[in-house]
C-alpha cells in the first residue's frame, strides 16, 4: 500500500516548504559533486566541515533556544510584534529569539549564496566543464531568502580579475556543500519546529 504523501497546504508556515526544498536541493548537489569530483576530496570522511559563517552569524546559538524552550516564558517574555515584508513572519507574534534566529538564517543564506554564485562563475569558465552548481539549488536559496525578507542590503557578487584556480574552486565547492548541507538540516529543523508550535 502506498502511504499518502504530505503536501504543504497554503496555510502552513510557508518557510517549511522552502526549507524542505533547500535540504533536498543541497543533498542532490552534494551527491552530484561526490560522483563528478571523484578524484577530489569530496566525501565527509576526507574533508573538514568548515563553516564560512563562523564568527559572522550565530544561527545555532540563536535558534537552539527555540527548540529547547517549548514554554515562551523561558524567553524572558521578550515578545515583540516583529513584522517583516516576508511571508514567513508576516502577521505573526514573534519572540525576540525567533526573530534573531530567522534573521541569522537569512544572513547565512546570503553568505552562502554569494560564495556559490562566485564559484559558479568560475566553474563556467573551466575548459573541462566538469561541474556546475545546480540552478535549482541557487533558486531555492533565493526563494527562502525572499520568504524571510529581512531587507538587508544586497551583497555584490565577488568579482575577480584573477585567472580562476579551478583546482581550488572544486575542492572549496566540496567543503562548502558539506557545510551548507549541515546548515540546511539546521534550518529545516527550525522551520519544522516553528510550523509545529
Amino acid at each position: 500500500r502506498n502511504l499518502p504523501v504530505a503536501t504543504p497546504d497554503p496555510g502552513m508556515f510557508p518557510c517549511l516548504h522552502h526549507s524542505q526544498n533547500l535540504l533536498r536541493a543541497v543533498s542532490n548537489m552534494l551527491q552530484k559533486a561526490r560522483q563528478t569530483l571523484e578524484f577530489y576530496p569530496c566525501t565527509s570522511e576526507e574533508i573538514d566541515h568548515e563553516d564560512i559563517t563562523k564568527d559572522k552569524t550565530s544561527t545555532v546559538e540563536a535558534c537552539l533556544p527555540l527548540e529547547l524552550t517549548k514554554n515562551e516564558s523561558c524567553l524572558n517574555s521578550r515578545e515583540t510584534s516583529f513584522i517583516t515584508n516576508g511571508s514567513c513572519l508576516a502577521s505573526r507574534k514573534t519572540s525576540f529569539m525567533m526573530a534573531l534566529c530567522l534573521s541569522s538564517i537569512y544572513e547565512d543564506l546570503k553568505m552562502y549564496q554569494v560564495e556559490f554564485k562566485t564559484m559558479n562563475a568560475k566553474l563556467l569558465m573551466d575548459p573541462k566543464r566538469q561541474i556546475f552548481l545546480d540552478q535549482n539549488m541557487l533558486a531555492v536559496i533565493d526563494e527562502l531568502m525572499q520568504a524571510l525578507n529581512f531587507n538587508s542590503e544586497t551583497v555584490p557578487q565577488k568579482s575577480s580579475l584573477e585567472e580562476p584556480d579551478f583546482y581550488k574552486t572544486k575542492i572549496k565547492l566540496c567543503i562548502l556543500l558539506h557545510a551548507f548541507r549541515i546548515r540546511a538540516v539546521t534550518i529545516d529543523r527550525v522551520m519544522s519546529y516553528l510550523n509545529a508550535s
Partner: nanobody, 114 residues
C-alpha cells in the same frame, strides 16, 4: 599579531629538495583546512596542496608524487616537503587557510635552477 609566517625557502638545483614551514596563529589554524599556494613570476597565485584538520591531503597534478604536505596541530604549523624539484616550481610560496583566507604572510622564495 603576525598571523602567518612562512620559512624554509631558498635555492635548489633541479632534482633537489627543500622543506618549507608555516607557523600560524592558533585561531587561524585550529580546525581549518590549511593550504600551500605558490606564485610564479608573472603568474597568479595558485593552490598547490591542502591538508584537512584530520590529515586528509590533496595535491595539484603538477606536484603529485613530489610534494608532501603535513601539519602539526599542537604547534599550529604546516609543512611542505618538496622533492624532485623542477625549474617550474620556482616562485614565492605562501600558506593560508583554504576557506576564509586570513591576511597573507610575506611568503618564502623558492628558486630552482642549475
Amino acid at each position: 599579531e603576525v598571523q602567518l609566517v612562512e620559512s624554509g625557502g631558498g635555492f635548489a638545483q633541479p632534482g633537489g629538495s627543500l622543506r618549507l614551514s608555516c607557523a600560524a596563529s592558533a585561531s587561524i589554524f585550529s580546525g581549518y583546512t590549511m593550504a600551500w599556494y605558490r606564485q610564479a613570476p608573472g603568474k597568479e597565485r595558485e593552490l598547490v596542496t591542502s591538508i584537512s584538520h584530520r590529515g586528509g591531503t590533496n595535491y595539484a597534478d603538477s606536484v603529485k608524487g613530489r610534494f608532501t604536505i603535513s601539519r602539526e596541530n599542537a604547534k599550529s604549523t604546516v609543512y611542505l616537503q618538496m622533492d624532485s624539484l623542477k625549474p617550474e616550481d620556482t616562485g614565492v610560496y605562501y600558506c593560508n587557510r583554504l576557506i576564509n583566507e586570513a591576511s597573507w604572510g610575506q611568503g618564502t622564495q623558492v628558486t630552482v635552477s642549475s
